[in-house]
């Protein structure tokens, strides 16, 4: 019996087609992805093959103005239109709190939404009961297939699930649910979830009875043969894990942003054992036409986005200096504003010992692309912020050793004075540079804001300590020459859309007046370029 698994993960609000790098589509003939194009390919496969499941491994939420405006209603509407068969909850599905998951998505989805390792307690237990499930048995042709869901247990640090959801260890939670499926005589079981490739492989190895793992969260690109675009494969598709009980378990993921449709064919014997598995992600490029009816629906929903982008979010009573003459040379108040917003967006009081789990932010000055003039009645719009942060990036959470941070700050000024983008803006960090010293030895003071404290204060950076830092995904991926971050990071979790973080902060504060306040200093006479 043959099953075709089509899968997406980490789509992050890319409802419209995008450029090759998943940013805004400029030249339509070169654009990729989007739900209209995805639907064309899915329908083509459904017509050609008998037993097809379309699965999503989480993080549909968050990433473009679509989510900012529609808050998840767009996800339910278009996933319903595409007839997804099941979805696992990702960490970003909790970005607008539990209510922001229940109302727009859980109540409106016409397909099951899954997670076995999220347990509700207190008053939420009865409210959310039945709205998501640990597993679902789906009828496929004359057979049944069990899908069991899982979600990153780091979600309380990455999003806003509140205090009434407990995120259990994935493997511990999955095993009894798989066992339950076995007692229901379900002998073909897919683990569908959002914990990253390392956990996907562990699930394949450790959870008895799981036949296939379909994952997300780590944006992992797997491919067999010559890859069709810029993504470099982390391994073959499917990635085969030998389980502890000796079975060959295929593990798949399909990069991110709806650029590819994962395509995996599995052959089962009559006892539900995997005989063979093969496939590859399908690049959704312009050779696949966009479905006209879905495209028309997208265009209809688009209208509200254009209106939103010109509405006032809040006001500034000071000039927001995002000029390259400032942000690439010294502390600029636009950099301070953005870093303050980044920290504010990551406030999670999950431990009584810590006022917050993260206090530090770094931001490459080259990523700040425009100032905002306060002499326009102080008005700040999404459109204004899109000029400041035009690259459609995310502000991510990483864990780094102090020694890596020290290298990053040395890199920040290693060729100071040439208006290069690597000069770092900061939050929760006080740095002093001495430019009279040789490159690689210019950081003379680096103090960081404590987290395990009731009154936050600045302490010297410790080289061997592990710190959490919020930074742009561009830096996490080694951009602007920050190779040491990419090479030495201990953990990397994708965060919220950059513009959304700043716009939410401005809306919350209503009136802003960021200052230049001595976060970055130069010792001796090296104050100016």
């Amino acid at each position: 019996w043959e099953l075709t698994i089509l899968h997406t993960n980490d789509v992050h609000s890319r409802l419209e087609q995008t450029s090759e790098d998943s940013s805004k589509c400029v030249n339509a003939s070169r654009c990729m992805g989007g739900v209209a194009r995805l639907f064309t390919k899915v329908q083509q496969i459904r017509r050609a093959e008998p037993n097809v499941l379309l699965l999503d491994a989480g993080d549909q939420y968050q990433g473009t103005i679509w989510f900012t405006v529609y808050k998840g209603a767009e996800v339910a509407h278009f996933m319903n239109a595409l007839r997804y068969d099941a979805m696992a909850l990702g960490n970003h599905e909790f970005d607008n709190g539990v209510e922001g998951l229940i109302e727009p998505l859980l109540k409106e989805a016409k397909f099951p939404i899954l997670s076995a390792n999220i347990k509700a307690k207190g008053p939420l237990a009865s409210q959310i009961s039945g709205l998501y499930l640990p597993y679902k048995v789906l009828p496929v042709g004359d057979e049944v297939v069990g899908i069991v869901g899982y979600t990153s247990k780091e979600t309380p640090f990455l999003s806003n699930p509140g205090t009434n959801l407990v995120f259990e260890d994935e493997i511990t939670a999955l095993q009894p649910e798989v066992d339950k499926l076995k007692t229901l005589n379900v002998n073909k079981i897919i683990a569908l979830g959002h914990s990253g490739f390392e956990m996907d492989k562990l699930i394949a190895q450790k959870v008895r009875g799981v036949d296939v793992v379909v994952g997300g969260h780590s944006n992992t690109f797997l491919y067999t043969g010559n890859p069709p675009s810029k993504e470099v494969p982390a391994g073959k598709y499917p990635f085969i894990v030998t389980s502890d009980d000796g079975r060959k378990v295929p593990v798949v993921q399909a990069y991110a942003f709806g650029k590819y449709l994962g395509y995996l064919k599995i052959e089962f014997d009559e006892r539900g054992n995997v005989i063979s598995s093969h496939g590859n992600p399908i690049l959704l490029n312009s050779s696949i036409p966009e479905d006209p009816s879905i495209k028309a629906d997208i265009n209809k929903w688009r209208i509200k986005l254009d209106n939103y982008s010109t509405q006032e979010l809040g006001k500034t009573i000071v000039y927001l200096d995002g000029s390259s003459q400032s942000c690439r040379f010294r502390e600029c108040n636009m950099g301070n504003l953005i870093c303050d917003a980044m920290i504010n967006n990551n406030l999670r009081h999950t431990d009584e010992m810590f006022w917050n789990h993260v206090s530090m932010c770094i931001l490459n000055g080259g990523g700040i692309r425009s100032p905002i003039d306060e002499r326009n009645n102080g008005t700040i719009t999404w459109e204004n912020l899109a000029a400041v942060l035009p690259f459609g990036g995310t502000f991510d959470l990483v864990q780094l050793k102090g020694s890596t941070l020290k290298k990053a700050f040395e890199h920040s000024v290693h060729r100071y004075g040439q208006s290069t983008g690597e000069f770092l803006q900061v939050g929760g960090i006080h740095v002093v540079y001495d430019l009279s010293r040789k490159p690689g030895d210019r950081v003379v003071k680096l103090d960081v804001l404590c987290t395990k404290c009731r009154v936050p204060s600045y302490d010297p950076l410790k080289m061997d300590e592990v710190y959490k830092v919020i930074l742009p995904n561009f830096l996490a991926n080694g951009g602007d020459g920050f190779q040491m971050i990419k090479d030495e990071l201990l953990r990397h979790d994708s965060g919220d859309q950059d513009i959304n973080v700043v716009s939410t902060y401005i809306s919350k504060m209503k009136v802003i007046y960021p200052a230049v306040e001595g976060r970055i200093k130069f010792s001796h006479h090296h104050h100016h370029h």
Partner: nanobody, 124 residues
Framework: DVQLQESGGGLVQPGGSLTLSCAAS????????IGWFRQVPGKEREGVSC????????NYADSVKGRLTISRDNAKNTVYLQINSLKPEDTAVYYC?????????????????WGQGTQVTVSS
């Protein structure tokens, strides 16, 4: 949580008719596919009819084809099963079951929510 309550069962003469109702609470019926099952003591639960979430597709077991009609009234959050030309072998406990999915099935494992059942006895 989804709760299902069957009603309309009872004692009926052979050749008679009956309409069973399944009322859902705690969830809008719109997105649920509903199945009717029956069980005779000592035997497995048997799927007799099903209606998908859109109401556009229905199916019936061969043993009851032509004698059953399944329908839904989403406004009333209720699904109905009309049984005509009742036979003694139709005597069973009738259960309605639901699951959030586009498609129907006659397989017990597929359904996530079950009612308590209503007894139908066909006897003269």
């Amino acid at each position: 949580d989804v709760q299902l309550q069957e009603s309309g069962g009872g004692l009926v003469q052979p050749g008679g008719s009956l309409t069973l109702s399944c009322a859902a609470s705690g969830f809008t019926l719109d997105y649920l596919s509903i199945g009717w099952f029956r069980q005779v003591p000592g035997k497995e639960r048997e799927g007799v009819s099903c209606i998908n979430s859109s109401g556009g597709s229905t199916n019936y077991a061969d043993s009851v084809k032509g004698r059953l009609t399944i329908s839904r009234d989403n406004a009333k959050n209720t699904v109905y099963l009309q049984i005509n030309s009742l036979k003694p072998e139709d005597t069973a406990v009738y259960y309605c079951a639901a699951h959030k999915y586009y498609y129907c099935s006659n397989k017990v494992a597929v359904f996530d929510y079950w009612g308590q059942g209503t007894q139908v006895t066909v006897s003269s």
